[in-house]
Interface confidence: low
């Protein structure tokens, strides 16, 4: 048993059959020493009497807010929440499993430049009695600090029958250098509770492997006299890191047709323009990636060509 | 080109042959962006390799001032890379594609390292650790780890020249 | 009493797909994870996948890649394994084991032949 | 996946002698937590598997007291102090360290 917060404990259960749970031993947090009952949830029931109660935690039931009284009066409050070990793994019960980039992937992160900012987010099905709460850090055994806002709802999706819900959150490494080569991953916690249920998720990254650029900005179309080719410019987005000369992007630029069977047209460039030909009903889209590193392409700004 | 005594180095050159770095070493092992190496065992093998960290002068600012110290650390690095790539966790078994850019990765980082070193100037280099892993496995795992590595550090590096060239060109 | 009773044996041909239940009472279905498992005729008991029943989260034995298919029906307390495509080397009896593995049930042969 | 080798592959027993039943596992069970996460289990002909032991060591509801089970994180073993003519069967190990949990051959125990 371990205390998650004032007053809040979680017991971790070995989900096993006829396993004998953990002894908990809960005390009242008060001077006085006679006279005290105890009581679980809303139920009248008294358990026990004394400063403390001790109880064998073994599944749901026996998880709550217990409560220790005298003459009428609440004298303290302890929440016992569980955390399932079933089969030798911890349960993931309350997180969707997102599977990308690979399995098991509850959390997502991203940031759009090298500021040391970042956006974490997470599905579930669960719409009610449900809270999270975010850690992070840099490096684990001797941690820098991460400074990480309040997790909230940020998406709601129906997904065949059912819901699904995306919270996120933004977290800012309080001493970021963005110049510097990472040697120490990002480590961000989260830990949800769902009703008695407790669990906790873990993403372990770097900075420069979640960067995803936003899509380049005042993309236009300047037609070039006496030709069907056209000069597609563009700028850096206002978010991406600066100086420019330093922190780099390239770019990929698409003529794709109306048809999604139609050949696109790719062209990849350092510039911030390029010459393309321009078919009847066309699109030019443009997208940017760090230079350097291959992290992920920002989503396409696109311009028709009519 | 930099040496010791503070001349400026052959920026666009360095500009040209860091970025080729960048792409040889993601065309050596694209993939490895999809593997989440930090869960495999063997942290200390690569936890010596040299980092651009912080302090080293390599953000703009610092690249103004002094671009000495800077040039240093990525020599530095350069040629503890350009080491651990002809190493016997590159030349051993398993053998490597005929075709694979290790090699040409190899000769970039020396090419560099001498532009930046030119003979008869030394700077202090790492020692390169002894890394002479007990099975082909784990020489695999370690390339790719060497190599994940090695695209974070030219990836600063080739930040550098490319700013050095826009702004501290002759 | 805990109980888990699986539905009956089936025939199939080569290609076909195959649906076995597993209806649980006894307890509360949607506390306790459920484990497929499988038995061909002399061979070693080889474990297919687990649903939890509450949140109809699955973990996959990779060997099925993509022919094993685990579903709940909470309302009804069962547990649904699918297995498409199959080969004469399906034949066996297929188990669903409650979370830990303490209560099985009866089995479902399932044979596959032209 | 962990491989789980299981010796001997039969196992001929007088009644009121004991039996040992081994297990190997191609990695370590034994996690930080102090628990070997280790099943052993008797198939009896006919009948679907019942569970004996569970975590290396601890037995099942209802399992008579003359199993035991222990081990290392590595090797494993299923004893039965004294064999009664009910405990004819196969036996198995199963590791849920990891998935896939796998499952040992079996070792089949007869009576003399």
């Known amino acids: 048993i371990w205390e998650l917060k004032k007053d809040v404990y979680v017991v971790e259960l070995d989900w096993y059959p006829d396993a004998p749970g953990e002894m908990v031993v809960l005390t009242c947090d008060t001077p006085e020493e006679d006279g005290i009952t105890w009581t679980l949830d809303q139920s009248s029931e008294v358990l026990g009497s004394g400063k403390t109660l001790t109880i064998q935690v073994k599944e749901f039931g026996d998880a709550g807010q217990y409560t220790c009284h005298k003459g009428g009066e609440v004298l303290s409050h302890s929440l016992l929440l569980l955390h399932k070990k079933e089969d030798g793994i911890w349960s993931t019960d309350i997180l969707k499993d997102q599977k990308e980039p690979k399995n098991k992937t509850f959390l997502r992160c991203e940031a759009k430049n090298y500021s040391g900012r970042f956006t974490c987010w997470w599905l579930t099905t669960i719409s009610t009695d449900l809270t999270f709460s975010v850690k992070s850090s840099r490096g684990s055994s001797d941690p820098q600090g991460v400074t990480c806002g309040a997790a909230t709802l940020s998406a709601e999706r129906v997904r065949g029958d059912n819901k699904e819900y995306e919270y996120s959150v933004e977290c800012q490494e309080d001493s970021a250098c963005p110049a510097a080569e990472e040697s120490l991953p990002i480590e961000v916690m989260v830990d949800a509770v769902h009703k008695l249920k407790y669990e906790n998720y873990t993403s372990s990254f770097f900075i420069r492997d979640i960067i995803k650029p936003d899509p380049p900005k005042n993309l236009q179309l300047k037609p070039l006299k006496n030709s069907r080719q056209v000069e597609v410019s563009w700028e850096y987005p206002d978010t991406w890191s600066t100086p420019h000369s330093y922190f780099s992007l390239t770019f990929c630029v698409q003529v794709q047709g109306k048809s999604k069977r139609e050949k696109k047209d790719r062209v990849f460039t350092d510039k911030t323009s390029a010459t393309v030909i321009c078919r009847k009903n066309a699109s030019i889209s443009v997208r940017a990636q760090d230079r350097y590193y291959s992290s992920s392409w920002s989503e396409w700004a696109s311009v028709p060509c009519s | 080109r930099a040496v010791p005594g503070g001349s400026s180095p052959a920026w666009t050159q360095c500009q040209q042959l860091s970025q080729k770095l960048c792409t040889l070493a993601w065309s050596a092992h694209p993939l490895v962006g999809h593997m989440d190496l930090r869960e495999e065992g063997d942290e200390e093998t690569t936890n010596d390799v040299p980092h651009i960290q912080c302090g080293d002068g390599c953000d703009p600012q610092g690249l103004r001032d002094n671009s000495q110290f800077c040039l240093q650390r990525i020599h530095q690095g350069l040629i503890f890379y350009e080491k651990l790539l002809g190493s016997d966790i590159f030349t051993g078994e398993p053998s490597l594609l005929p075709d694979s850019p290790v090699g040409q990765l190899h000769a970039s980082l020396l090419g560099l390292s001498q532009l930046l070193q030119p003979e008869g100037h030394h700077w202090e280099t790492q020692q390169i650790p002894s890394l002479s892993p007990s099975q082909p496995w784990q020489r695999l795992l370690l390339r790719f780890k060497i190599l994940r590595s090695l695209q974070a550090f030219v990836a600063v590096a080739a930040r550098v020249f490319a700013h050095g060239a826009a702004t501290l060109s002759p | 009493e805990v109980q888990l009773v699986q539905s009956g044996a089936e025939v199939k041909k080569p290609g076909a797909s195959v649906k076995v239940s597993c209806k649980a009472s006894g307890y509360s279905f949607t506390d306790h994870n459920m484990n497929w498992v499988r038995q061909a005729p002399g061979q070693r008991l080889e474990w297919m996948g687990v649903i939890n029943p509450n949140y109809g989260t699955t973990t996959y034995n990779q060997k099925f890649k993509g022919r094993v298919t685990i579903t709940v029906d909470t309302s009804a307390s069962t547990a649904y394994m699918e297995l498409s495509s199959l080969r004469s080397e399906d034949t066996a009896v297929y188990y669903c084991a409650r979370r830990g593995f303490a209560y099985w049930g009866q089995g479902t042969l399932v044979t596959v032949s032209s | 996946d962990i491989v789980m080798t299981q010796t001997p592959l039969s196992l001929p027993v007088t009644p009121g002698e004991p039996a040992s039943i081994s297990c190997r596992s191609s990695?370590?069970?034994?996690?930080?937590?102090?628990?070997?996460?280790l099943n052993w289990f008797l198939q009896k002909p006919g009948q679907s598997p019942q569970l004996l032991i569970y975590l290396m060591q601890t037995r099942a509801s209802g399992v008579p007291d003359r199993f035991s089970g222990s081990g290392s994180g590595t090797d494993l073993t299923l004893k039965i102090s004294r064999v009664e003519a009910e405990d004819v069967g196969v036996y198995y190990c199963q590791q849920i360290a990891e998935y896939p949990f796998t499952f040992g051959s079996g070792t089949k125990l007869e009576i003399k």
């Open positions: 990695k370590s069970l034994l996690y930080k937590d102090g628990k070997t996460y």
